[in-house]
Amino acid sequence: MAVTACQGLGFVVSLIGIAGIIAATCMDQWSTQDLYNNPVTAVFNYQGLWRSCVRESSGFTECRGYFTLLGLPAMLQAVRALMIVGIVLGAIGLLVSIFALKCIRIGSMEDSAKANMTLTSGIMFIVSGLCAIAGVSVFANMLVTNFWMSTANMYTGMGGMVQTVQTRYTFGAALFVGWVAGGLTLIGGVMMCIACRGLAPEETNYKAVSYHASGHSVAYKPGGFKASTGFGSNTKNKKIYDGGARTEDEVQSYPSKHDYV
């Protein structure tokens, strides 16, 4: 019962986590304009992994996709890759874990097979969560570096009365969503791995068999042979994911009245 609960909870937590990773990856607020000196601004800038947006005080928002692939910073590309790998692994993990759930009966699937699948999905969730946390952390580090660089250069090029204030960017909501989601996926994965230990058959009991030989009557009683879980040996058909990662440049979305608080 506890195993089923642990497995089920692990699955639900991972599902929420992966949904969060997908949400974070799609969100536009990875970095937002720093409003420390000016809490009310007429033009507010924010950027995501796929496009950058400008919200005007008039309420209009204009977003532009990053039309280039090669012209983008390597760090941004790395973050994109980490998040996509995290989503792909998480999605496969979810698919595997559905079939591994103890509460779901699929034909005459043995407990050892379910244990293997639970462990596989658990590992996938752990790696998925780590990818998301790594991706978000890399982006956050990039922001911190750029923040202090732009702070140092903030009033450079000041000629007479004319000021050129550089726009500084700080952590956006997507970073926090990503960290939390990555953490949840990681926790879900650990729970699946824990559940897997309980799913593995602990003991194989053999029924007593009587052999009647001439002159002797010997009864062989059941012995306490430990069952071999053999996680590595009895993996049958490993699923191979053909990613075919498509990169789609977003078309410019025309300015639209955007609900904002």
Epitope: Q33, E56, S57, T167
Partner: antibody
């Protein structure tokens, strides 16, 4: 057709308060911010502030904070500006204007002339 | 507050002539996020409210004749009327739309000989 119809001219005594209205038609009132602009005796223009009719959030020019209060009535698609503790300095033409792309003002009311005199 | 300085304060030209007026801001009006300059030009004819001519420094409002052209970036902006018509008699204002409070220039009065 878009229209911003402002209330008629006002003659007020110093120390009094006045409420100017701006009735809109022809567009979604809550979809666009409403700005208020002051023009003293044919001189330059001064931005007083704006209001987002959807969230009823306001942003004021520091100079007019405490002097002007911006409100809206969504049911009648009307924006209001109340000016209090009037002095002769407040004598001017007041315009309401709708926000557009680039924070520009694309449609303007015809203006309300306020005269403060004892 | 951003200070907007317009020059000249008044201008007298003959119909058909090309005219340029300048507007300078005390701070850059360029937004790196969308590569746009938040400067607007208005035309105010006597006894009328101002009329939007150009926003984002160079984008002409629909219905505005193409003889009106806005240019410039950062802190220096120009409004050009390629061939002045009698109906262009007005005061022209530039406005900072980049940061609060929105501020206007003192205006350039265009008179026709």
């Amino acid at each position: 057709e878009f229209q911003l119809q402002q209330s008629g001219p006002e003659l007020e005594k110093p120390g009094a308060s006045v409420k100017i209205s701006c009735k809109t038609s022809g567009y979604s009132f809550t979809g666009y911010n409403m700005n208020w602009v002051k023009q003293s005796n044919g001189q330059s223009l001064e931005w007083i502030g704006h209001i987002d009719p959807y969230y009823v959030t306001t942003t004021y020019n520091q100079k007019f904070r405490g002097k002007a209060t911006l409100t809206v009535d969504k049911s009648s698609s009307t924006a209001y500006m109340q000016l209090k503790s009037l002095t002769s300095e407040d004598s001017a033409v007041y315009y309401c204007a709708r926000s557009f792309y680039g924070n520009a003002f694309d449609y303007w009311g015809q203006g309300t002339t306020l005269t403060v005199s004892s | 507050d951003i200070v907007m300085t317009q020059s000249p304060s008044s201008l007298t030209v003959t119909a058909g002539e090309k005219v340029t007026m300048s507007c300078k801001s005390s701070q850059s009006l360029f937004n790196s996020g969308n590569q746009k300059n938040y400067l607007t030009w208005y035309q105010q004819k006597p006894g009328q409210p101002p009329k939007l001519l150009i926003y984002w420094a160079s984008t002409r409002e629909s219905g505005v004749p193409d003889r009106f052209t806005g240019s410039g970036s950062g802190t220096d902006f120009t409004l050009t009327i390629s061939s002045v018509q009698a109906e262009d008699l007005a005061v022209y204002y530039c406005q900072n739309d980049y940061s609060f409070p929105f501020t206007f220039g003192s205006g350039t009065k265009l008179e026709i000989k």
